[in-house]
Structure formats: structure tokens, C-alpha cells
């Protein structure tokens, strides 16, 4: 018999339920007690190297001491039994680990899947964390035969793939047992025919064919998975344009039985579409396959569906009897071009006179016209045909434009610059919106867009910058020519000015001073200047602030002290904050003009 260990703890490897009570007993060997001259009274219990209070001990007899824990909350407790030997030295007798956790809960939501070509896999919800090694066993049987147990692996404890091959059209019963050191529970049993749990392989070899006759259709063909010989399939077919992120779906009722091709209709011409397809058992019992690999195709071209936006500009410096007119138009977006644009056709007809034709590859045409009224038309052409014509009246030189839009407003919203107006009473064919950045350093380079005559609110479709002042002009266009333009200034987003105003004195008296300043250049304003503040002070005095309306460029400071040095600076404010200008100093005279000491 060995003196080491000097005793033992019972139970040796305890597993206890969390928040339960637990008692351990340390029994000393008689020879050890004899060697160390101790008995159970000398036992010291420790958990994780901390001494347990004596109140938790019970001396059972000369050789045995017990310790009781109530409401165990730790998952892992190192418990040691020690003896106080000669001179209060502690000698370890024995140690155990108390493992605590919870019994397994009844597994729930048991479900099985048969992936085509693979064996059946079942999964379940194992319930709460037990903090213990818990083994899950999937059990299955026919009415006449028990299958081998499927033991879930440690790294995937809530699923298991059976070892036997799937037989369709015979019902199977399946359940799960969960077991750990604290108990064993069984799930509800489920009974099913594996044919209702099939997840087919996705259709493959998906291909897309276009049609020369119809620019709005594409034909899909595919190869069905082998499971089609066991079950009838239904399909989901989804498609999107190449650049889109969301999918559209063919109505499911159109693809509700086994097939290997489908024609998709109502598509846009000359557009690349991406398709994918999946399938499942036609009665909806089972699982959808994964999506097939994507396949793409391009619909055939169609003639352009819309005439381009069309406008003109007249060079103000015109020679006697003639004027230079620049006709401008916008490239059609792909969904309206419906194919590769080949060229543009422009016709110009002088009022009740002969017609001139132009074929142009660019998006502008400069022509010399007489001072008469002209009718211009524009069509765009692709491989299939021509668009409808955009018609524009270029009025005679003496034409007086009237009927502007009313209540023109411009405002930023959702990172866009919106423009709205009240429509004139007269029938408007279209509106032309023009805008440019106002700058002291560069000319106003205009961008433009066209809106239908029914529109009275839109946003500027350009690359707009923050803290820039945009001059926006709205021109209504009538059958006989353009109406009067209306303009407004706006900012996409204001900021504080980049510089403050530079203040100076215009006139200084004994008790007052007239200050003046220049309006800030538009390039440094960064927004609408709403007001100015003048700050002035003496070397020893407090600062005084005076608010001044933004329309002013001078202001008189009164009640000043004579023969005194003043420091003054000025700030300009937009809706987003202010910026100070440089400080300026002046001294009031000791006497007023003509005054003697």
C-alpha cells in the first residue's frame, strides 16, 4: 500500500446539475494519518486554490470529512482535499474536478432531407447548451426493420447522415436520442416517405437563345436532373438584367410540370439578361434544388423607342440676315436606344419653304439660318429602324417669348437638387432645364435636360458638386417656340464660407466710424450669405457683436470713445455656419473736426 495518495475523494469524477447541491467526502488512509499524525479534523478543503469555509465541512469520523456545495453555478470546479501537517504546512491528499451542466432537453424540429444522389441527412434543434458532452443518436426503422444508429459527430452535434441507401415509396420512422451524464431524452417520432424529402440536383446545361423575329423573347433550354425519373418536377425561373441586383420571376403556374425548355416573353430589346433555374417535386413536398449555374443571353435589337431630348442655342453675335444656331440632343439610354445607334437624321424646314436634310454622328449640329421661323426634326437610327421624330420650332428673329413658369423653386433633398414650378396655363409641349456653376473665375458651362410637358417637379440629372452655386433656368416650350426663361440660384449642399469679409473704414469720427466691405466672391461663399456679424473691441474692453443684413456693404459704429484704438473683424454666415475675416484696427481722433482743446 502506498502512502501517496494519502486518501481519496468520493465521488471520483462527479458530474452534477447546475444550481443543484453536491457533497464530496475525503477519506484519509490510516497509515497516512499515522505518518502525518493527523485525522479528519486536520482536513482543509479548497476549490480552485481557495479555502472553503469550515462551516461547509462535516467531520464524519476520524478518517472522513465531507464538504457540501449548494446551488453550484460554476461549470468546472477543481476540488482538493488537503491536510494541515507539522507546523501548519499543507499537504495535498487528493483532487477531483466537479463538472456541472444540464441534462439534455428533448430534441425538437427534427427534419430530414434526401439530397439527390446522397444519403438521407436529418437535423434537429438540440435545445439549450448543456455544458457537457452530449451525444445525439439518430434512430430510424421501417415497420419491419431497424436501421443502424447514426451517431452525430462532435463538430456537428445536431445533424447526422445515415449509412444506408434511400428507398422511396416506403415509410420510415425517425427520432433522435440525446444523452449526457445527467440524463437521456427522446424526440418526437416522425414518419414519412423519403420521396417527400427530396432535394433534387439543380437543372444543368442551361442555355439561352434569342429570336430575330421578336426582340422581346429569349428561349431557355436545360437538362433535368436524374430524379425526374422518380418524381414530377416543377420549376422556378428567375431573370434580371446584367447590371441589376434583384431578380424577377416567371409566374410559377407557367412552369408547374416537368419540361426542358421555356420561352421568356415581355423582355426589353437589345438587353443582356441573366437566367437561373431550380426545381423540386411538383406537389411542393420536399425541397427546392440549389439554383443552376447562371446563363445569359441578349435580346434582339428593336427600333429606338423614343426620340432624343432636343434643344437649340442661338449665337448672340449674328450677321445681317443670318444667325448661327447650334442644335443639341442627348444620347438615348440603352433601354430606349434598343440597339447600337448608327446615326442621327436632322431635317430643317424654313417656314413654308424647302427642306434641308442632315445625317450626323455626333450629338450636335451647327447651322446658319435666316431670321425666319424654322421647324427642326430629329430621329435616331439603329440596325432595325428609326425612332419617332422630336420636333422643335425655332422661332423667327423678332419672336417675343412670353408665358414663363411661375413660382420657380430649387432645393436639395436626398443628395439631389430638385426644381419645381407652377405650370403656365398654356399647353406646354416640354420643359428645358439648364444649369451651370456660377464662378468669378470661369464662364458658366451649361448642362441641360428635357422634361415632358406634364412635369412640374424634377431633379437635375448631372454630376453636381457641393458648395457650388448653381444657376438653374427653366424654359417652357410651346408649339410655336420657347416661352420666357425663369432662373433661380441653388446649392446642392451649403458649407461655411471659405473666407470671411475684409472690413475697412470709410470714415472715422471722434465717436463713430463708418465701416465698409465688399460682397464675398461667389467662389468663396459656399452657400447663401444670410447675414454678417461685426465684432469690435478696445484693447481692454469686452467685444461687442452687431448683426448686419447680408444686403449691406457698409455699417456705422456709434457711441465710440475718442482717442481709442479699436479692433474690428467681420464674419459671414451661410445656413451651415460662418467664417471670420481678418482683423482690422483703427483709432478714433481725440477731437472732432473743428473742435479745439
Amino acid at each position: 500500500e502506498l502512502l501517496d495518495p494519502c486518501g481519496y475523494i468520493s465521488p471520483e469524477s462527479p458530474v452534477v446539475q447546475l444550481h443543484s447541491n453536491f457533497t464530496a467526502v475525503c477519506v484519509l488512509k490510516e497509515k497516512c494519518m499515522d505518518y502525518f499524525h493527523v485525522n479528519a479534523n486536520y482536513i482543509v478543503w479548497k476549490t480552485n486554490h481557495f479555502t472553503i469555509p469550515k462551516e461547509q465541512y462535516t467531520i464524519i469520523n476520524r478518517t472522513a470529512s465531507s464538504v457540501t456545495f449548494t446551488d453550484i453555478a460554476s461549470l468546472n470546479i477543481q476540488l482538493t482535499c488537503n491536510i494541515l501537517t507539522f507546523g501548519q504546512l499543507e499537504q495535498n491528499v487528493y483532487g477531483i474536478t466537479i463538472i456541472s451542466g444540464l441534462p439534455p432537453e428533448k430534441p425538437k424540429n427534427l427534419s430530414c432531407i434526401v439530397n439527390e444522389g446522397k444519403k438521407m441527412r436529418c437535423e434537429w434543434d438540440g435545445g439549450r447548451e448543456t455544458h457537457l458532452e452530449t451525444n445525439f443518436t439518430l434512430k430510424s426503422e421501417w415497420a419491419t426493420h431497424k436501421f443502424a444508429d447514426c451517431k452525430a459527430k462532435r463538430d456537428t452535434p445536431t445533424s447526422c447522415t445515415v449509412d444506408y441507401s434511400t428507398v422511396y415509396f416506403v415509410n420510415i420512422e425517425v427520432w433522435v436520442e440525446a444523452e449526457n451524464a445527467l440524463g437521456k431524452v427522446t424526440s418526437d417520432h416522425i414518419n414519412f416517405d423519403p420521396v417527400y424529402k427530396v432535394k433534387p440536383n439543380p437543372p444543368h446545361n442551361l442555355s439561352v437563345i434569342n429570336s430575330e423575329e421578336l426582340s422581346s423573347i429569349l428561349k431557355l433550354t436545360w437538362t433535368n436532373p436524374s430524379i425526374k425519373s422518380v418524381i414530377i418536377l416543377k420549376y422556378n425561373i428567375q431573370y434580371r438584367t446584367k447590371d441589376a441586383s434583384t431578380w424577377s420571376q416567371i409566374p410559377p403556374e407557367d412552369t408547374a410540370s416537368t419540361r426542358s425548355s421555356f420561352t421568356v416573353q415581355d423582355l426589353k430589346p437589345f438587353t443582356e439578361y441573366v437566367f437561373r433555374i431550380r426545381c423540386m417535386k411538383e406537389d411542393g413536398k420536399g425541397y427546392w434544388s440549389d439554383w443552376s449555374e447562371e446563363a445569359s443571353g441578349i435580346t434582339y435589337e428593336d427600333r429606338p423607342s423614343k426620340a432624343p431630348s432636343f434643344w437649340y442655342k442661338i449665337d448672340p453675335s449674328h450677321t445681317q440676315g443670318y444667325r448661327t444656331v447650334q442644335l443639341v440632343w442627348k444620347t438615348l439610354p440603352p433601354f430606349e436606344a434598343n440597339g447600337k445607334i448608327l446615326d442621327y437624321e436632322v431635317t430643317l424646314t424654313r417656314w413654308k419653304s424647302h427642306l434641308q436634310n442632315y445625317t450626323v454622328n455626333a450629338t450636335k449640329l451647327t447651322v446658319n439660318l435666316t431670321n425666319d421661323r424654322y421647324l427642326a426634326t430629329l430621329t435616331v437610327r439603329n440596325l432595325v429602324g428609326k425612332s419617332d421624330a422630336a420636333v422643335l420650332t425655332i422661332p423667327a428673329c423678332d419672336f417675343q417669348a412670353t408665358h414663363p413658369v411661375m413660382d420657380l423653386k430649387a432645393f436639395p433633398k436626398d443628395n439631389m437638387l430638385w426644381v419645381e414650378w407652377t405650370t403656365p396655363r398654356e399647353s406646354v409641349k416640354k420643359y428645358i432645364l439648364e444649369w451651370c456653376v456660377l464662378s468669378d473665375k470661369a464662364p458658366c458651362i451649361t448642362d441641360w435636360q428635357q422634361e415632358d410637358g406634364t412635369v412640374h417637379r424634377t431633379y437635375l440629372r448631372g454630376n453636381l458638386a457641393e458648395s457650388k452655386c448653381y444657376l438653374i433656368t427653366v424654359t417652357p416650350v410651346y408649339a410655336d417656340g420657347p416661352g420666357s426663361p425663369e432662373s433661380i440660384k441653388a446649392y446642392l449642399k451649403q458649407a461655411p464660407p471659405s473666407k470671411g469679409p475684409t472690413v475697412r473704414t470709410k470714415k472715422v469720427g471722434k465717436n463713430e466710424a463708418v465701416l465698409e466691405w465688399d460682397q464675398l466672391p461667389v467662389d468663396v461663399q459656399n452657400g447663401f450669405i444670410r447675414n454678417y456679424t461685426i465684432f469690435y473691441r478696445t484693447i481692454i474692453g469686452n467685444e461687442t457683436a452687431v448683426n448686419v443684413d447680408s444686403s449691406h456693404t457698409e455699417y456705422t459704429l456709434s457711441s465710440l470713445t475718442s482717442d481709442t484704438l479699436y479692433m474690428v473683424r467681420m464674419a459671414a454666415y451661410t445656413d451651415e455656419g460662418g467664417k471670420d475675416g481678418p482683423e482690422f484696427t483703427f483709432t478714433t481722433p481725440k477731437f472732432a473736426q473743428g473742435e479745439i482743446e
Epitope: L3, D4, H37
Partner: antibody, heavy 115, light 108 residues
Framework: QVQLVQSGAEVKKPGASVKVSCKAS????????ISWVRQAPGQGLEWMGW????????DYAQKFQGRVTMTTDTSTSTAYMELRSLRSDDTAVYYC????????WGQGTLVTVSS | DIQMTQSPSSLSASVGDRVTITCRAS??????LNWYQQKPGKAPKLLIY???SLQSGVPSRFSGSGSGTDFTLTISSLQPEDFATYYC??????????FGQGTRLEIK
């Protein structure tokens, strides 16, 4: 203070038995065991066995198994060691010692085995 | 059985010397080793128990060390009354308890 007092010297004939006593005082007799050790003339120490004064459990060295008996009388705080079938090589000083630590020893009892 | 081997079996030293006696166990005995001193005609006396604990009443010049299989008894400064025979003994495995063969310490 702790004392272990042994019985006096004995002379025995081969084949006879000897019973040596060891009276303990100065501590609680039942709290610790008694070990027996002998030492032949000019030789080293040889452990014979141990008895628990509390439970009466005992351990004997293999060499003495069947020939030795160790007992205690708690009423008198005395331990006894009886060795039977004595041989001449059993001639030695027999010591009792307290516990398995041998922290206190008796004065020794000389047992001479001679024909 | 566990064999205990002491070395040297005898040694000569002078008063004031530092003396070391070693004891080797044939297998690990943890720290369950005691050292005894025996003078002629007297019962042995416990010096050190549990490898390094000094028995009460024993002078502090005696010290013990070691664990497992190798142990040492050291007398830091030899006194005239220290000339005797010294035994090591293991209590780890019982039965049997075993002693070393002894080391005789003589005056040089």
C-alpha cells in the same frame, strides 16, 4: 512528555516464543500506531511491522509473516509483539517506535536465543 | 520492495566540517523519507521527517532535502556529539518499510 517503556531483556531457547511489551505515555495512545523494529548485533535496522492502536489493523514484513503477532491493550496503553519459533538469528535488540514516522522509540529489549 | 542505498557507508570528518550523506531509493518515494541518528547502545533518534521537516528539539544544523529518488542529509557544522551512525528510511510503500544500510560518521 512522550515515553515508550519496554519490558526487560529475555533469554530464550530455539523454538520458544517471546512477548515484548511497550507501554506508552504522554499522548493519546489510540491516536497513533506502534511500529516494531529490530537490530541484530553490529547490524542495521530491520522493520518488523506496525499496528494501529485505534483500529487494530496491522502490517507485517513478509519475513515475519506467520511467526509474529502484534497486539495492543488500549486500557493500559500497551503494545505487544510476540515472536514464535525463535532461532539463533533472532537474537537482537527489539524496539517499539511511535507511528510510521518513528518519532519516539522505546529503550529496546535484548532478546537472546541460545541453546 | 523499495531498496534504500546510503553513501558513503562511513566517513571521517572534523568538528566544524560540513557533512553530506546521500540516500537513493530504487523507485520514487515522493517525500516520504526520514533520517535517524543512532549512538552505540542507544535507540535511534528521529532527525528529519518528510524529507525536509526538522523534528522538534533537533538542532538547526541538521537539514534534509530531495524528493523522488535522491535525498540528502546535511550537517552544516559538525559538533562532537554528532559522531554516530545515520540511517535513512522510507515510509512511502508499506509493507515493508525499509532502511538504508547506515552511514558511520567518525572523528578524523
Amino acid at each position: 512528555q512522550v515515553q515508550l517503556v519496554q519490558s526487560g531483556a529475555e533469554v530464550k531457547k530455539p523454538g520458544a516464543s517471546v512477548k515484548v511489551s511497550c507501554k506508552a505515555s504522554g499522548y493519546t495512545f489510540t491516536s497513533l500506531g506502534i511500529s516494531w523494529v529490530r537490530q541484530a548485533p553490529g547490524q542495521g535496522l530491520e522493520w518488523m511491522g506496525w499496528i494501529s492502536a485505534y483500529s487494530g489493523n496491522r502490517d507485517y514484513a513478509q519475513k515475519f509473516q506467520g511467526r509474529v503477532t502484534m497486539t495492543t491493550d488500549t486500557s493500559t496503553s500497551t503494545a505487544y509483539m510476540e515472536l514464535r519459533s525463535l532461532r539463533s538469528d533472532d537474537t537482537a535488540v527489539y524496539y517499539c517506535a511511535r507511528s510510521l514516522r518513528f518519532d519516539y522509540w522505546g529503550q529496546g529489549t535484548l532478546v537472546t536465543v541460545s541453546s | 520492495d523499495i531498496q534504500m542505498t546510503q553513501s558513503p557507508s562511513s566517513l571521517s570528518a572534523s568538528v566544524g566540517d560540513r557533512v553530506t550523506i546521500t540516500c537513493r531509493a530504487s523507485q520514487s518515494i515522493s517525500s516520504y523519507l526520514n533520517w535517524y541518528q543512532q549512538k552505540p547502545g542507544k535507540a535511534p533518534k528521529l532527525l528529519i521527517y518528510a524529507a525536509s521537516s526538522l523534528q522538534s528539539g533537533v538542532p538547526s544544523r541538521f537539514s534534509g532535502s530531495g524528493s523522488g529518488t535522491d535525498f540528502t542529509l546535511t550537517i552544516s557544522s559538525l559538533q562532537p556529539e554528532d559522531f554516530a551512525t545515520y540511517y535513512c528510511q522510507q515510509s512511502y510503500s508499506t509493507p515493508p518499510i525499509t532502511f538504508g544500510q547506515g552511514t558511520r560518521l567518525e572523528i578524523k
